[in-house]
């Protein structure tokens, strides 16, 4: 019980994650710039990794994509790269856990089986949550070093004034949502990996016991009656002696001790 | 490099009319707002007037309300002021501003030009 409770729990989580991921990724608000000195007029700016947006006070609110590739930083390449592969491992690592699943059944798959696919689905998970808290601190350490406090000076032309701008760039609500929602995948892919324990088959030694009647009469069988736990085959044709019981030594059984909770 | 070219400012009578004009260019990834700022001799540089490029939302100095009108044209990437019922007191320095994102991961920078002498005169 309390592995299949595991497992699921590790799947719902890292199932939150993953949408979470998927979330943060396609969100606007990956940094906002806002000048401290702003002459204009009141205009916010947030940008993503696909596009960058305006908002101005009257509410109107316009994005443009990012058409160039050679324009744009490689970090900013990488942070698209770790997002993209954090949800393509966690989307096939769903996908595999939802097999796994012990309340699932789908013919006569062994619990070997789903213990191999919730091992390999919870590393999915690991996988995921690690590139997405990557992805996301990789941006948040591009803002601090490249462009957190940037203080401009603006020539124009010959002769031209020279203005002094600081621009103050700030995490946005996406940096936080990746941060909590890789998190949780890394959590799920965990749990996964710790209800696959509970999952394995062991190799345990079930001592069966024979119990005969004792009699005068009773003589000597060779190859006696096997005993047998009801679990497996007794593989050893053990002989079998009159007067009371005697122990059946290492019967192996495969199947988990978990099956009849 | 972004540069601001300004042009129409001269000399005119009161009461005329002048129309000013600010194109931008360069590596503009988009313009947040464009506007107007003058300075006359042995005063501090004051906010004439500015729009919003997506919106155009407009913001006037008390001074010139009803008077001088800002529009914008997108797809050129500039700003016009015209002033109309001009006064002797308008005769300043005028500075076009631009509030733009600039190259491929925008960054945002304020950029004045080398600004546009309008004296007003009879």
């Known amino acids: 019980m309390a592995v299949t409770a595991c497992q699921g729990l590790g799947f719902v989580v890292s199932l939150i994650g993953i949408a979470g991921i998927i979330a943060a990724t396609c969100m606007d608000q990956w940094s906002t710039q806002d000048l401290y000195n702003n002459p204009v007029t009141a205009v916010f700016n947030y940008q993503g990794l696909w596009r960058s947006c305006v908002r101005e006070s009257s509410g109107f609110t316009e994005c443009r994509g990012y058409f160039t590739l050679l324009g744009l930083p490689a970090m900013l390449q990488a942070v698209r790269a770790l997002m993209i592969v954090g949800i393509v491992l966690g989307a096939i690592g769903l996908l595999v856990s939802i097999f796994a699943l012990k309340c699932i059944r789908i013919g006569s798959m062994e619990d070997s089986a789903k213990a191999n696919m919730t091992l390999t689905s919870g590393i999915m998970f690991i996988v995921s949550g690690l590139c997405a808290i990557a992805g996301v601190s990789v941006f948040a350490n591009m803002l601090v070093t490249n462009f957190w406090m940037s203080t401009a000076n603006m020539y124009t032309g010959m002769g031209g004034m020279v203005q002094t701008v600081q621009t103050r760039y700030t995490f946005g609500a996406a940096l936080f949502v990746g941060w909590v929602a890789g998190g949780l995948t890394l959590i799920g892919g965990v749990m996964m990996c710790i209800a696959c324990r509970g999952l394995a088959p062991e190799e345990t030694n079930y001592k069966a016991v024979s119990y005969h009647a004792s009699g005068h009469s009773v003589a000597y069988k060779p190859g006696g009656f096997k005993a047998s736990t009801g679990f497996g085959s007794n593989t050893k044709n053990k002989k079998i002696y009159d007067g009371g019981a005697r122990t059946e030594d290492e019967v192996q059984s495969y199947p988990s001790k978990h099956d009849y909770v | 490099q972004v540069q601001l070219v300004e042009s129409g400012g001269g000399l005119v009578q009161p009461g005329g009319s002048l129309r000013l004009s600010c194109a931008a260019s360069g590596s503009i990834f988009s313009i947040n707002a464009m506007g107007w700022y003058r300075q006359a001799p042995g005063k501090q540089r004051e906010l004439v007037a500015a729009?919003?490029?997506?919106?155009?939302?407009?913001n006037y100095a008390d001074s010139v309300k009803g008077r001088f009108t800002i529009s914008r044209d997108n797809a050129k990437n500039t700003v016009y002021l015209q002033m109309n019922s001009l006064k002797p007191e308008d005769t300043a320095v005028y500075y076009c501003n631009a509030d733009l994102l600039v190259g491929g991961f925008p960054r945002r920078n304020v950029y004045w030009g080398q600004g546009t002498q309008v004296t007003v005169s009879s």
């Open positions: 729009i919003t490029f997506g919106g155009g939302s407009t």
